[in-house]
Amino acid sequence: GSQHIRAEKAMVDGSWLDLAKRSKLEAQPFAHLTINATDIPSGSHKVSLSSWYHDRGWGKISNMTFSNGKLIVNQDGFYYLYANICFRHHETSGDLATEYLQLMVYVTKTSIKIPSSHTLMKGGSTKYWSGNSEFHFYSINVGGFFKLRSGEEISIEVSNPSLLDPDQDATYFGAFKVRDID
Amino acid sequence: GSQHIRAEKAMVDGSWLDLAKRSKLEAQPFAHLTINATDIPSGSHKVSLSSWYHDRGWGKISNMTFSNGKLIVNQDGFYYLYANICFRHHETSGDLATEYLQLMVYVTKTSIKIPSSHTLMKGGSTKYWSGNSEFHFYSINVGGFFKLRSGEEISIEVSNPSLLDPDQDATYFGAFKVRDID
Amino acid sequence: GSQHIRAEKAMVDGSWLDLAKRSKLEAQPFAHLTINATDIPSGSHKVSLSSWYHDRGWGKISNMTFSNGKLIVNQDGFYYLYANICFRHHETSGDLATEYLQLMVYVTKTSIKIPSSHTLMKGGSTKYWSGNSEFHFYSINVGGFFKLRSGEEISIEVSNPSLLDPDQDATYFGAFKVRDID
């Protein structure tokens, strides 16, 4: 009797452990979204970037939603958020309107329940892109650890969007859940 | 009988839990590799950096392999990858040939099964390092979340490798597994 | 008998699983500390930043301690550490003492047992902030994966602290535990 219970227990335990491991390691939300170069807005002021790939190349998403240019949280938790934004200009693209540029990124959280928007992270640089050089490039990286609630939305705003590098390795943002909320 | 089974169960469960926790928290692969300054290549174009420390100072590795200048994935999963690359020039460092520099990093994934190489992340800046200043410095940071398969390799390419800062706190890259693949 | 044991087992197992999940996902230490702008030191050389918020806005801490300007580790483990530091100057703030600036961050680990301090990560840039532009901005981001022991302390040093951007989305640092030590 005792031997039978032990064997059965081990078998059930195994499946519990499997379930525990699977629920922990596989259900954790994440996203890595890469810029959709066919739909970059123009302008030099702060602009929200709404067109991102989530299902091609390095783009991917799981247990989060991408809708209307925003990354939507489906599961409460503490997440690590990051963004990498590259800007570039080649003299063959034409003259810049100004040599003094403010190249910035803002990672923003919007709460639908209480309609409000807050900047979680910002980064960038003022640059002097003179005509003495035929090519200019600059990248920004930001990252941080934030408490996100289900329904909250993450979006990316940049200055000078027409200067964005459209490569998937250059301009992207993402998130992954690290921990539950106590 | 029932009391004996309960006690035995708690004991066995404890070890299962212990095993579950250990397998989750301790077997997760990671690496943090710091530049080996004794073997930095020369060149101005994109150069692969093959010499890194994985076992001294801040350098460390677990459940991943470092071989032939590449970080090899041993366990399928979603990983957070990062790199920090610092460039510097002092007037005593040598005769800098140009003030206009393209200081770049490329984090690359190579698949052996299908021999191909793809850039996962890039960052950097064009810089004007004039002789009016005796010292120049610039750092790049990139990071992102990627699906990696066992056998795939991560490598780092930079421009102007002779300008690299050889300190372990300056020039490094790494990875840690966050999640299994569904 | 066998049915009763099975039901009891499922109940006990459930609580074990719950405990396992809670101990894993909720007890993992983290911190995200944002600059306290009311107490930024002056000077242009390397200065330790000791005033940070851990309990307002985006600032938060769990299973770590913030004391005397340092983030104290309470639990051995491998942690991902990060910092984002923004510098800015507007002509209305007054003239800069010099147009040639070294804008740097150093993320430092101090061990109390063996009184010593080591730089884990550094980043930054030399900048030429000329009077031709009314506004200047620059951000640094660094991040890396490090083994930390209970009692060790993390602190942030910067150059030119008077140029720091005091916004919580601009100047912050943090850590989260990823993995136990084997």
């Epitope: 003495n132 | 020369s42 002789g131 | -």
Partner: antibody, heavy 122, light 107 residues
Framework: EVQLVESGGGLVKPGGSLRLSCAAS????????MSWVRQAPGKGLEWVAG????????YYPDTVKGRFTISRDNAKNSLYLQMNSLRAEDTAVYYC???????????????WGKGTTVTVSS | DIQMTQSPSSLSASVGDRVTITCKAS??????IAWYQQKPGKAPKLLIY???YRYTGVPSRFSGSGSGTDFTFTISSLQPEDIATYYC?????????FGGGTKVEIK
């Protein structure tokens, strides 16, 4: 066609001065570091000055430091060498040479002018 | 300063011969060596850089090898138009220094 043409050489007395010029054509001059290399009669080659592409860095060996000044005008695609306090041992053919692209700290020369002769004699 | 010692100072060989010139640096220069050809009354021409890389348009009979302090320049099959003086140059650290030259003649 990529070309470098030197001028300004001649006969000068010891202690005198001379200014050499080099006119560049056929390439984007502002993108390249440049040098002057000399060759004494029947002797080997000696590097005497270098200048970065933007002109803010200048380099010299000890033999000419303080006496020679290299400069450039990127708008005019021109390189110069101002030589003061000339000595008999400065007698040589002076070549203008373009530094090839490569490691930013390493200088070798892929395009050379035909040279201009400087004779220092009383 | 890094001294470059070239040998031999002159050599005579027949058309079709394999010709080898050596260059020794006074300290380690890794692979930072260039080789030039200079014909009488003409400017030098770059043949090899970084010890073994042939410059654009240079015939394949010219090759270079070596690292550290010892370097070799080879003409695999000497041609009449190869009559010239050959110089090595270290491009490792300033001041940029040249070898004394090797004069190659036809027997």
């Amino acid at each position: 066609e990529v070309q470098l043409v030197e001028s300004g050489g001649g006969l000068v007395k010891p202690g005198g001065s001379l200014r050499l010029s080099c006119a560049a054509s056929g390439f984007t001059f502002r993108n390249y570091a440049m040098s002057w290399v000399r060759q004494a009669p029947g002797k080997g080659l000696e590097w005497v000055a270098g200048i970065s592409s933007g002109g803010t860095y200048t380099y010299y060996p000890d033999t000419v430091k303080g006496r020679f000044t290299i400069s450039r005008d990127n708008a005019k695609n021109s390189l110069y060498l101002q030589m003061n306090s000339l000595r008999a041992e400065d007698t040589a053919v002076y070549y203008c040479a373009r530094r090839d692209y490569g490691d930013v700290y390493e200088w070798y020369f892929d395009v050379w002018g035909k040279g201009t002769t400087v004779t220092v004699s009383s | 300063d890094i001294q470059m010692t070239q040998s031999p100072s002159s050599l005579s060989a027949s058309v079709g011969d394999r010709v080898t010139i050596t260059c020794k640096a006074s300290q380690d220069v890794r692979t930072s060596i260039a080789w030039y050809q200079q014909k009488p009354g003409k400017a030098p021409k770059l043949l090899i850089y970084s010890a073994s890389y042939r410059y654009t348009g240079v015939p394949s009979r010219f090759s270079g090898s070596g690292s550290g302090t010892d370097f070799t320049f080879t003409i695999s099959s000497l041609q009449p138009e190869d009559i010239a003086t050959y110089y090595c140059q270290q491009h490792y650290s300033s001041p940029w220094t040249f070898g004394g030259g090797t004069k190659v003649e036809i027997k």
